[in-house]
């Protein structure tokens, strides 16, 4: 039976800067020749047919929920991408995370900007901080790391605070294991 | 109480290795960087690096990548220095700090005693 | 040659004010990195002294004061004791060489 296919974001965050780009490609099952993909936003059907949808030059409207779909197969799962337009803006490898899977956090500057004395908070508590920019990378998340996070930094000596990102962290499901 | 204990003196040949610790208590160890920090003798500070034992990151000097290792084990609330190849010009001091976030500002507010290593044939 | 440039040493009497001076360049006090004060004792762990320019932890005499001007800062220790006798280090962050910098160290001694 054909598994759902999946959408994969490149670069892989669901959180971008009004102008950036990002590819979603729908990635599907390799039992078969894929002659065409349908894409859905927000429910509407795309004109693009490839199995890849380029977004360049994003714009608010591109903001929504995305889904495709090969041949006659099952819809993918939703994805969902948020155009922003600010100083800061956190973004996280998934939203929802597998407990043992990796999660990355990065605080983004408006136009690649540089971004300086970053600090990461975690419900409120400062976490991670650094003169200059950094990262987050955890490469087994755990319950523990479920949680609202935000970032602050410094562009053009003005300081600046990201909106703040629900991270959940979900444990995975136990696998059943039938007696013969 | 916030604490950090470094292992005791060391005395080595070169081409030995070595690794030394230091071990946090009273706060939650994951949570702020360690650094190491070398005072050879009769001189002033270096900044070797430093590491975030939450993720692991990892940042050295430009003086000291490749010279040493930075490593952490938080489930012991322990940071490490690790040289695989000592010289004679690695006699020095060895400190560790933590580094905190006070009113926006990022300092070493916690130090350990030093660790003192003897390099010579 | 350290980034930061501090006096080698310097000297007073009991009761003295002394100042030590801190002096970096654009790229590290001058682009809005902090300065720190550490107080380095033989054979004790070193102590932070001032954090910020400025602020004081807790515990430390109001003795000790910090400035900052330009690409400089300083460290004032008004009325000097005998246990004042230490090494001082200032300490920022450089963005062009992307490392922690301290100064090169300052021998107080007290006559």
């Known amino acids: 039976v054909p598994q759902k296919p999946k959408v994969s974001l490149n670069p892989p965050w669901n959180r971008i800067f009004k102008g950036e780009n990002v590819t979603l490609t729908c990635n599907g099952n390799n039992f078969f020749e894929v002659s065409s993909t349908k894409w859905f936003h927000n429910g509407s059907l795309s004109e693009e047919t490839n199995s890849s949808l380029n977004i360049v030059n994003a714009k608010f409207e591109d903001s929504g929920e995305y889904k495709c779909q090969h041949q006659q197969v099952n819809e993918s799962e939703p994805v969902y991408l948020e155009v922003f337009s600010d100083w800061l803006l956190l973004q996280a490898s998934a939203e929802v995370v597998m407990e043992g899977q990796p999660l990355f956090l990065r605080c983004h500057g408006w136009r690649n900007w540089d971004v300086y004395k970053v600090i990461y908070y975690k419900d409120g508590e400062a976490l991670k901080y650094w003169y200059e920019n950094h990262n987050i990378s955890i490469t087994n998340a755990t319950v523990e790391d479920s949680g609202t996070y935000y970032c602050t930094g410094k562009v053009w000596q003005l300081d600046y605070e990201s909106e703040p990102l629900n991270i959940t962290v979900i444990k995975a499901p136990r696998e059943k294991y039938w007696l013969q | 109480e916030v604490q950090l204990v470094q292992s005791g003196a060391e005395v080595k040949k070169p081409g030995e290795s070595l690794k030394i610790s230091c071990e946090g208590s009273?706060?939650?160890?994951?949570?702020?960087?360690i650094a190491w920090v070398r005072q050879k003798p009769g001189k002033g500070l270096e900044w070797m690096g430093i590491?975030?034992?939450?993720?692991?990151?990892?940042k050295y000097g430009p003086s000291f990548g490749g010279q040493v290792t930075i490593s952490a084990d938080k489930s012991i609330n322990t940071a490490y220095l690790e040289w695989s190849s000592l010289k004679a010009s690695d006699t020095a001091m060895y400190y560790c700090?933590?580094?905190?976030?006070?009113?926006?500002?990022?300092?070493?507010?916690?130090w350990g005693l030093g660790t003192l290593v003897t390099v010579s044939s | 040659q350290s980034v930061l440039t501090q006096p080698s040493s310097v000297s007073g009497a009991p009761g003295q004010r002394v100042t030590i001076s801190c002096t970096g360049s654009?790229?590290?006090?001058?682009?809005?990195?902090?300065v720190h004060w550490y107080q380095l004792v033989s054979g004790a762990a070193p102590k932070l002294l001032i954090y910020?320019?400025?602020n004081r932890p807790s515990g430390v005499p109001d003795r000790f004061s910090g400035s900052k001007s330009g690409t400089s800062a300083s460290l004032v220790i008004a009325g000097l004791q005998a246990e004042d006798e230490a090494d001082y280090y200032c300490?920022?962050?450089?963005?062009?060489?992307?490392?922690?910098?301290f100064g090169g160290g300052t021998k107080l001694t007290v006559l």
């Open positions: 700090a933590r580094l905190a976030l006070i009113r926006g500002s990022i300092i070493f507010d916690y």
């Open positions: 009273g706060y939650r160890f994951s949570s702020y960087w």
């Open positions: 590491i975030y034992p939450y993720d692991s990151d990892t």
């Open positions: 654009s790229s590290n006090i001058g682009a809005d990195y902090d």
């Open positions: 910020g320019y400025t």
């Open positions: 300490q920022s962050y450089d963005s062009s060489l992307s490392e922690v910098v």
